[in-house]
């Protein structure tokens, strides 16, 4: 029950996180015009990964896409790549985790396969979350660098006669959405990995094989020890030898509902 809850919660948290990563990637407010200690303008500038926008006092908002690819800063391209990789991994992770959910029955899929899928999706969520956090952090670092550079030469002009106020940019809402979303996806991934451990069948049974000797003495020989990790095929223990001896596994048994936590 606890495993199902952990897996389900991990899935929901990751789902919210990935939705947040998608939202952050699409948002226009990655950087917004710094209004503090600046001349008050009748226009408000803000920029996203894909376009820059200007909202005028009149209420009119004009957005322009970055139609060039080669002309864009390498850092912006890197952030775009990280966010897209995060979304793609997260989406695949979600798809895998849907089939891995313990509460969803798909044919005769064994728990070990579900454990595998849960771990895979968990790792994907972790990487997805890390990509988003990295992308947002790289952009934030770029902003901080540019902010102090533009503060250093706040006013530029010809001999101080004509002043051009440089527009400074600060953190936009998308950065906070991205950080939170990345964190949620990461937490969801960790929860899925924890759930995977509970899903894996712990077949730590000591197999015993008994055979009747031709004499009056009875020999007891311990069979092969198998600790199942839940990965790979769930192969049955082989017979040690055929001479009338039978392993316990040859009598086909399915795990009962009490076998796992």
């Amino acid at each position: 029950m606890a495993v199902t809850a952990c897996q389900g919660l991990g899935f929901v948290v990751s789902l919210i996180g990935i939705a947040g990563i998608i939202a952050a990637t699409c948002m226009d407010q990655w950087s917004t015009q710094d209004l503090y200690n600046n001349p008050v303008t009748a226009v408000f500038n803000y920029q996203g990964l894909w376009r820059s926008c200007v909202r005028e006092s009149s209420g009119f908002t004009e957005c322009r896409g970055y139609f060039t690819l080669l002309g864009l800063p390498a850092m912006l391209q890197a952030v775009r790549a990280l966010m897209i990789v995060g979304i793609v991994l997260g989406a695949i992770g979600l798809l895998v985790s849907i089939f891995a959910l313990k509460c969803i029955r798909i044919g005769s899929m064994e728990d070990s396969a579900k454990a595998n899928m849960t771990l895979t999706s968990g790792i994907m969520f972790i990487v997805s979350g890390l990509c988003a956090i990295a992308g947002v952090s790289v952009f934030a670092n770029m902003l901080v660098t540019n902010f102090w550079m533009s503060t250093a030469n706040m006013y530029t002009g010809m001999g101080g006669m004509v002043q051009t106020v440089q527009t400074r940019y600060t953190f936009g809402a998308a950065l906070f959405v991205g950080w939170v979303a990345g964190g949620l996806t990461l937490i969801g991934g960790v929860m899925m990995c924890i759930a995977c451990r509970g899903l894996a069948p712990e077949e730590t049974n000591y197999k015993a094989v008994s055979y009747h000797a031709s004499g009056h003495s009875v020999a007891y020989k311990p069979g092969g020890f198998k600790a199942s990790t839940g990965f790979g095929s769930n192969t049955k223990n082989k017979k040690i030898y055929d001479g009338g001896a039978r392993t316990e596994d040859e009598v086909q048994s399915y795990p009962s509902k009490h076998d796992y936590v």
Epitope: N45, G59, E62, V162, T164
Partner: antibody, heavy 120, light 113 residues
Framework: EVMLVESGGGLVKPGGSLKLSCAAS????????MSWVRQTPEKRLEWVAT????????YYADSVKGRFTISRDSAKNTLYLQMLSLRSEDTALYYC?????????????WGQGTSVTVSS | DILMTQSPSSLSVSAGEKVTMSCKSS????????????LAWYQQKPGQPPKLLIY???TRESGVPDRFTGSGSGTDFTLTISSVQAEDLAVYYC?????????FGAGTKLELK
């Protein structure tokens, strides 16, 4: 047709108060940014205040800050300018203006104006 | 505050003449975000409110004759009337639409010779 009609002007003593009104019609009043601009007897144009459409943020000229208040009643399609502690330098013709939504913050419509005279 | 300086303060012209008036701002009115200039030109005839002629430094307001042309960028702007008509006799104001407080120039008065 867009129309802006100002009212409420008159003669007032220094330190007195006055409330100007601007009745708007012919457009979706609530979504437009509105301003008050005054023209002094010397024919100089001075921006007084602005109220942003939708958001309701307000901006004031330093000379009127703390004394004048711009507000709007979207239900009545009316813009107001509450003027307190009036001074002789506030004597002017007050225009109600609309900022065009595609006109780069320019004032595309102006009312005929209402006259305010501050004198003892 | 942004200072808007208009020159000349008055102009005497004959009908059909080409007229150019200047407006200079103390700070650039060019927005880096969209590369647009936030400057407007208004025409005011006696006894009337000002009328918008040009916005964004160079875009003609609808209904404005094409003899009116706005140009310039950053801090230096110009309004040109290619062939002055009798109905163009008025006072022309430029306005900073970029910074609060929104400021106007003192105006250029266009008179007949």
């Amino acid at each position: 047709e867009v129309m802006l009609v100002e009212s409420g002007g008159g003669l007032v003593k220094p330190g007195g108060s006055l409330k100007l009104s601007c009745a708007a019609s012919g457009f979706t009043f609530s979504s437009y940014t509105m301003s008050w601009v005054r023209q002094t007897p010397e024919k100089r144009l001075e921006w007084v205040a602005t109220i942003i459409g939708g958001y309701g943020n307000t901006y004031y000229a330093d000379s009127v800050k703390g004394r004048f208040t711009i507000s709007r009643d979207s239900a009545k399609n009316t813009l107001y300018l509450q003027m307190l502690s009036l001074r002789s330098e506030d004597t002017a013709l007050y225009y109600c203006t609309r900022l065009g939504q595609t006109q780069r913050n320019a004032m595309d419509y102006w009312g005929q104006g209402t006259s305010v005279t501050v004198s003892s | 505050d942004i200072l808007m300086t208009q020159s000349p303060s008055s102009l005497s012209v004959s009908a059909g003449e080409k007229v150019t008036m200047s407006c200079k701002s103390s700070q650039s009115l060019l927005n880096s975000g969209n590369q647009r200039n936030y400057l407007a030109w208004y025409q005011q005839k006696p006894g009337q409110p000002p009328k918008l002629l040009i916005y964004g430094a160079s875009t003609r307001e609808s209904g404005v004759p094409d003899r009116f042309t706005g140009s310039g960028s950053g801090t230096d702007f110009t309004l040109t009337i290619s062939s002055v008509q009798a109905e163009d006799l008025a006072v022309y104001y430029c306005q900073n639409d970029y910074y609060y407080p929104l400021t106007f120039g003192a105006g250029t008065k266009l008179e007949l010779k």
